[in-house]
């Protein structure tokens, strides 16, 4: 009886650290689903390594991916999103090193857009607003939201506010008047899905007024 | 060369358990999924379900949920299944069976143990 | 779940000759289909898989096609070595195999 030789067959000399991570962006394009892998230690030789993803596809049981410089990169509509994939790190065919992962569980949602902040006098308050992608998506709709803000002069000292929605009111009381702000925001699945915080949004800058200024967006 | 052996046979009583083994050798254990496959007497094969030995993942024939439970030792390259509250519908020859070498998780099975015959009896 | 209808469930033949076994799947498998020689007393011998790539050291008397939900077997070139019964197995979705068919000598 016959079988064939596959990765049992590799020897000690490869035991580097092939050691990577992932995430999924769901219906990042139209229908199709992204898959994003790279190596946790970047001076990883990735010449001739390969990934590839089994299981959990509809259609297809597996699928080689791209590789974009140092990442490692899919985009299907074939990922069933029920059940954990086979992640492996692949030479001339044989497996290196494998990771099962449920892709619903390592997702990074699209960072925010459309930041922008309006100052209201007669309330004295800022109105934070940005939008989202994901409440256009089927999947991955509901998201906890991170929005950072700090005095530019103050570099490390950014304050957070969690909130599910895409408004936020900042009191003027609580900023320093005549000042300008740094704010951003990102977002993190929050709901049957799990994952990664986004990429910040691009940040945006007011200036807070003195006690008394004229209503009406904040200059960036 | 691949060879995975198996007890030739197994006697046990009604409503006990038994932990059948199969024992790897020539071959790096822990990069090939092990299957364990049923065969009644005179009648087919029938899939139980299918074990990582790297990280002890599982992928199971629900029919057997609950009746047969699937682990490795990788210190000494044996898989082993578990098989509880026996009854005379579990008589059969009980075979392991590597895997062939795709990583995706249902694939064919290249080599194959003589198979362990247990028979439940009072 | 996928079911495999395997027909015939016995057949005779002559050395010498050919005989073709055939496995209806339920569904689509696409082409997620292995072969298997089973001998009273030992563990079944992979023939085929993927429908129609031989395992190392199979002679090429044995062959595979098909597609979709219809494949099929082949022996020609009978010898008495090949007196067994034979399986289908799809893998496209869990693991299930056909009922067998008992090849014996006419």
């Known amino acids: 009886e016959s079988g064939y030789a596959q990765n049992g067959d590799l020897e000690d000399a490869e035991l580097d650290d092939y050691s990577f991570s992932c995430y999924s962006q769901l219906e990042v394009n139209g229908s199709q689903h992204s898959l994003t892998c790279a190596f946790e230690d970047p001076d990883v030789n990735t010449t001739n390594l390969e990934f590839e993803i089994c299981g959990a596809l509809v259609e297809v049981k597996c699928l080689s991916f791209r590789k974009l410089q140092e990442i490692y990169f899919i985009e299907t509509k074939k990922f069933l999103l029920i059940g954990k994939s086979n992640i492996c790190v692949k030479v001339g065919g044989k497996s290196l090193t494998c990771k099962k992962i449920d892709l619903t569980t390592i997702v990074k949602p699209e960072a925010p857009f459309d930041l922008s902040v309006i100052y209201r006098e007669g309330a004295n308050d800022f109105v934070v607003t940005f939008n989202t992608s994901h409440l256009q998506k089927k999947y991955v709709k509901v998201l906890m939201h991170d929005v950072a803000y700090r005095q530019e002069k103050d570099e490390n000292k950014w304050m957070h506010v969690n909130l599910s929605s895409t408004k936020l009111t900042l009191l003027q009381r609580n900023l320093q008047p005549e000042a300008m702000y740094e704010i951003k925001v990102r977002s993190i699945p929050d709901h049957y899905f799990k994952g990664f915080w986004s990429e910040w949004s691009p940040s945006y800058y007011f200036r807070t007024p003195e006690i008394n200024n004229s209503p009406g967006e904040m200059d960036p | 060369q691949v060879q995975l052996q198996q007890p030739g046979a197994e006697l046990v009583m009604p409503g006990a358990s038994v932990k059948l083994s199969c024992k790897a050798s020539?071959?790096?254990?822990?990069?090939?999924?092990m299957h364990w496959v049923k065969q009644r007497p005179g009648e087919g094969l029938e899939w139980i379900g299918e074990?990582?030995?790297?990280?002890?993942?599982?992928n199971d024939n629900q029919k057997f949920k609950g009746k047969a439970t699937l682990t490795v030792d990788k210190s000494s390259s044996t898989a082993y299944m578990q098989l509880s509250s026996l009854t005379s519908e579990d008589s059969a020859v009980y075979y392991c069976?590597?895997?062939?070498?795709?990583?995706?998780?249902?694939?064919?099975?290249?080599?194959w143990g003589q198979g362990t015959s247990v028979t439940v009896s009072s | 779940d996928i079911q495999m209808t395997q027909s015939p469930s016995s057949l005779s033949a002559s050395l010498g000759g050919k005989v073709t076994i055939t496995c209806k799947a339920s569904?689509?498998?696409?082409?997620?289909i292995a072969w298997y020689q089973h001998k009273p007393g030992k563990g079944p011998r992979l023939l085929i898989h993927?429908?129609?790539t031989l395992q190392p050291g199979i002679p090429s008397r044995f062959s595979g096609s098909g597609s979709g939900r219809d494949y099929s077997f082949s022996i020609s070139n009978l010898e008495p070595v090949d007196i067994a019964t034979y399986y289908c197995?799809?893998?496209?979705?869990?693991?299930?195999f056909g009922a067998g068919t008992k090849l014996e000598l006419k």
């Open positions: 069976a590597r895997r062939l070498y795709s990583n995706s998780y249902y694939y064919a099975m290249d080599y």
């Open positions: 020539g071959y790096t254990f822990t990069s090939y999924w």
């Open positions: 074990i990582d030995p790297s990280d002890s993942y599982t």
């Open positions: 569904q689509d498998i696409k082409k997620y």
């Open positions: 993927y429908t129609s």
């Open positions: 197995l799809q893998y496209d979705n869990l693991l299930t």
